[in-house]
């Protein structure tokens, strides 16, 4: 039959070439002379000329060595024709299978593989995977089957078998206890890939295993005992820097310190923070310390890490003895701001109040007093007793110096310490109103027609406070009542001025006496311009005449 079984040819054959492989034979050769030919890749198309056929005998020839890794199978067609070129058979499929030789070593996909694993993990923990490839066949032969192994480990601490590798997957795992970053931060493994499933050619690569930090070391105070001196009353004052050492990875959460005041700070006077670079604990005062109340504080500070410990570790504690230094403290007025009620207009020399300060220091220091700010100059202060007296007229209605009935004075106390210190107090004098102002009309100039005149309404004001104000009473004096009438309205806060007799056009003085609810009287002259007109008027020309 015009059929040929698949032909197997080993790669890398040594010849001699051409090498006879198989004979094509048509049974039509009994009837006529047959000529054989082949076509296809490897014959008449690229790669041309690898195979040929003896035209008359049908022997299939191999012209050169084959490379399975280049082409693993050739598919050719055999042809049989008679002398006249007519085809005597259908084209025949010829399969040539190139069989593998172990002509390639394994190759690692990288020269150096990098992986990491946490220190102190359980044996068995997977670290990383390495990969090697081999171009040879791994399906029908072991030529391309790679087996992995670890050739060496550096350093060999705590011993030389810290890792193992899965022989077929290349997965590296921890096999022993004792990974300790603080002792060995990195291992270098020389790894091997061997083909023939471990019995063939070997290649090597490097696997670098970084040991990652776990918080397995506690920070330790060095030293553990401190003495510090702090002036009393200082807030935000740096008391002491506490130093710790930690074997874990610097600047990691397992290294960064967290400080806690465990005892000795009953009044919550201190605070402790971590310096971002040095990792020191910076102990500072949160509140001022009082030498007179307590001149020594013993603090107990514990240190841990930002990250939790991975195992039970003893925590380190430091003891800090803080000595409070005495400072000459300023006298303090009691109260710092004193409110005193006093009548306005009291006589000069009249006592206003006594305003004194206390000295926090335990020594019996002498305190002297003086006025620091007295805008109107109304007061004096005895330097020894703190007695404040009036030396000017206290005027509640003085808008320049008095706001909302209050006159504000600042006083100073000075001790006789070395150097002396001063403290200030604020004296707020609430001035009690006295009926010392009479009512005043507004406006004090009016214009009015002498025919059918319009009533003039004047507002009444009084600088005093109730009850020294309305209701007001009005009275015309000095014969002004001949031509004019003055009436206070029902509310008692305005006066209505009316012209009751004809006056020729001119300017006149109207003498108006107003008195308040406390009968404080005030005489005011209203200048009235009378115009020759009817009803309402605003201006009119004319000479002035007294009347």
């Amino acid at each position: 039959d015009w059929v040929v079984a698949p032909i197997s040819v080993p790669e890398n054959g040594k010849g001699p070439f051409p090498q006879r492989l198989n004979q094509l034979k048509s049974n039509k050769d009994r009837d006529t002379k047959i000529f054989y030919s082949i076509t296809g890749p490897g014959a008449d198309s690229p790669p041309e000329g690898v195979f040929a056929v003896e035209k008359e005998t049908g022997w299939l020839l191999l012209n050169k060595p084959l490379d399975r890794e280049e082409i693993a199978k050739y598919e050719l067609f055999g042809h049989a024709v008679s002398e006249n070129g007519a085809s005597v058979e259908d084209p025949m499929n010829i399969s040539i299978i190139v069989t593998d030789q172990n002509d390639h070593k394994p190759k690692f996909t990288q020269d150096t593989f990098r992986g990491s694993v946490l220190e102190g993990v359980l044996p068995g923990t997977s670290v990383m995977q390495v990969t090697a490839t081999d171009e040879d066949d791994a399906i029908y032969t072991y030529n391309g089957v790679v087996a992995y192994s670890i050739h060496s480990q550096e350093p060999k601490d705590p011993h030389d078998l810290m890792f193992t590798i899965h022989r077929s997957t290349g997965t590296i795992s921890v096999i022993s206890s004792g990974l300790d970053r603080e002792k060995v931060p990195e291992y270098t493994l020389t790894i091997q890939a061997t083909d023939m499933d471990g019995d063939g050619s070997t290649t090597t690569a490097v696997a670098v295993v970084e040991i990652l930090d776990a918080n397995d070391n506690a920070p330790m105070f060095d030293p553990q005992k401190y003495e510090a001196h702090v002036p009393e009353n200082a807030v935000g004052h740096e008391v002491q820097r506490l130093t710790v050492t930690d074997l874990d990875a610097p600047n990691s959460p397992a290294w960064r310190a967290t400080y806690l005041i465990m005892g000795g700070d009953d009044g919550d006077h201190f605070t402790i923070t971590t310096h971002p670079e040095s990792n020191q604990g910076i102990l500072t005062t949160r509140k001022g310390l009082d030498f007179e109340a307590k001149n020594q504080h013993t603090l107990y500070v514990e240190v841990t890490n930002e990250a939790p410990f991975v195992l039970k570790l003893p925590t380190s504690t430091a003891t800090i003895v803080v000595h409070v230094e005495d400072v000459n403290e300023a006298p303090v007025f009691v109260p710092p701001s004193k409110v005193v009620e006093v009548q306005e207009g009291i006589p000069t020399g009249e006592p206003v109040c006594v305003y004194t300060a206390e000295d926090p220091d335990k020594e019996n220091q002498k305190i002297s007093y003086r006025i620091l700010r007295d805008p109107a100059g109304w007061l004096a202060m005895d330097p020894d007793s703190g007695q404040v007296t009036a030396v000017g007229t206290l005027d509640r209605e003085d808008e320049q110096f008095v706001r909302n009935n209050i006159y504000e004075v600042m006083v100073l106390a000075m001790d006789n310490g070395s150097p002396p210190t001063t403290g200030t107090g604020t004296l707020l004098l609430t001035l009690i109103d006295v009926n010392d102002h009479g009512p005043v009309p507004e406006p004090r100039q009016i214009t009015i027609c002498n025919q059918s005149p319009v009533r003039q309404v004047l507002n009444i004001t009084d600088k005093d406070l109730s009850p020294h104000t309305s209701p007001f009473q009005a009275q015309l004096t000095d014969d002004s009542d001949i031509y004019w009438t003055a009436e206070v309205n029902e509310e008692g806060d305005t006066v209505v001025l009316s012209l009751k007799k004809f006056l020729k056009q001119d300017t006149y003085d109207v003498h108006l006496s107003l008195s308040d609810h406390g009968n404080k009287e005030q005489l005011t002259v209203i200048r009235a311009t009378v115009c020759d007109c009817h009803g309402h008027v605003e201006t009119c020309p004319g000479p002035w005449k007294g009347g």
Epitope: V121, H166, D216, V310, L311, K312
Partner: antibody, heavy 117, light 111 residues
């Protein structure tokens, strides 16, 4: 001499709790992972739990997960197994053993835990 | 069902040699050279007799030897003695949890 000595076994009712201890001597305890292995009467060995040298990593078999807790105190060279919600199938001899380099060695003498009402 | 397969029992006469097999997979016995063998006498704790396929701890008789081929490891005992009668367990390191697999155990009887 390298030695492991268990204590704390006994009879307990189903649902009850028990704590096993294993005191180590003769080697640097904190340098080695430790494990608990049990053997039910007439049966083979079953790996129950393991803990790394620092105590930072632990492993539990599915059969005991959520009920048993392994711990260690390196300052006392002692391994512990806290067993809660005990069941009849937890009845076994419990051994502590050092775990490393693919091998369990040395082993303690074992402690019998019987779970029965 | 144990992860590693061992024969339930083997027997031999004093002075003879016996072999106990331990079959696993390409992820345990076949993948690593970390096969261990333990001897357990009744009422006693297991005792390590071989580690890393064929390494004997100090104090273990050289009559005990180990080997591995593919996915199967073997324990051989030569010159059987009465005190060798015990249960023998193999274990292998494995990729992934639980990291240690045990065989079901083999009862050795010295006839």
């Amino acid at each position: 001499e390298v030695q492991l000595l268990e204590s704390g076994g006994g009879l307990v009712q189903p649902g009850g709790s028990l704590r096993l201890s294993c005191a180590a001597s003769g080697f640097t305890f904190s340098s080695y992972a430790m494990s608990w292995v049990r053997q039910a009467p007439g049966k083979g060995l079953e790996w129950v739990s393991a803990i790394s040298g620092s105590g930072g990593s632990t492993y539990y078999a599915d059969s005991v997960k959520g009920r048993f807790t392994i711990s260690r105190d390196n300052s006392k060279n002692t391994l512990y197994l806290q067993m809660n919600s005990l069941r009849a199938e937890d009845t076994a001899v419990y051994y502590c053993a050092s775990w490393g380099t693919g091998t369990l060695w040395p082993w303690g003498q074992g402690k019998m835990v019987t779970v029965s009402s | 069902q144990s992860a590693l397969t061992q024969p339930a029992s083997v027997s031999g006469s004093p002075g003879q040699s016996i072999t106990i097999s331990c079959t696993g997979t390409s992820n345990d016995v076949g993948a690593y050279n970390y096969v261990s063998w333990y001897q357990q006498h009744p009422g006693k704790a297991p005792k390590l007799i071989l580690s890393e396929v064929n390494k004997r701890p100090s104090g273990v008789s050289n009559r005990f030897s180990g080997s591995k081929s593919g996915n199967t490891a073997s324990l051989s005992i030569s010159g059987l003695q009465a005190e060798d009668e015990a249960d023998y367990y193999c274990s292998s390191f494995t990729s992934g949890l639980p990291w240690v697999l045990f065989g079901g155990g083999t009862k050795l009887t010295v006839l």
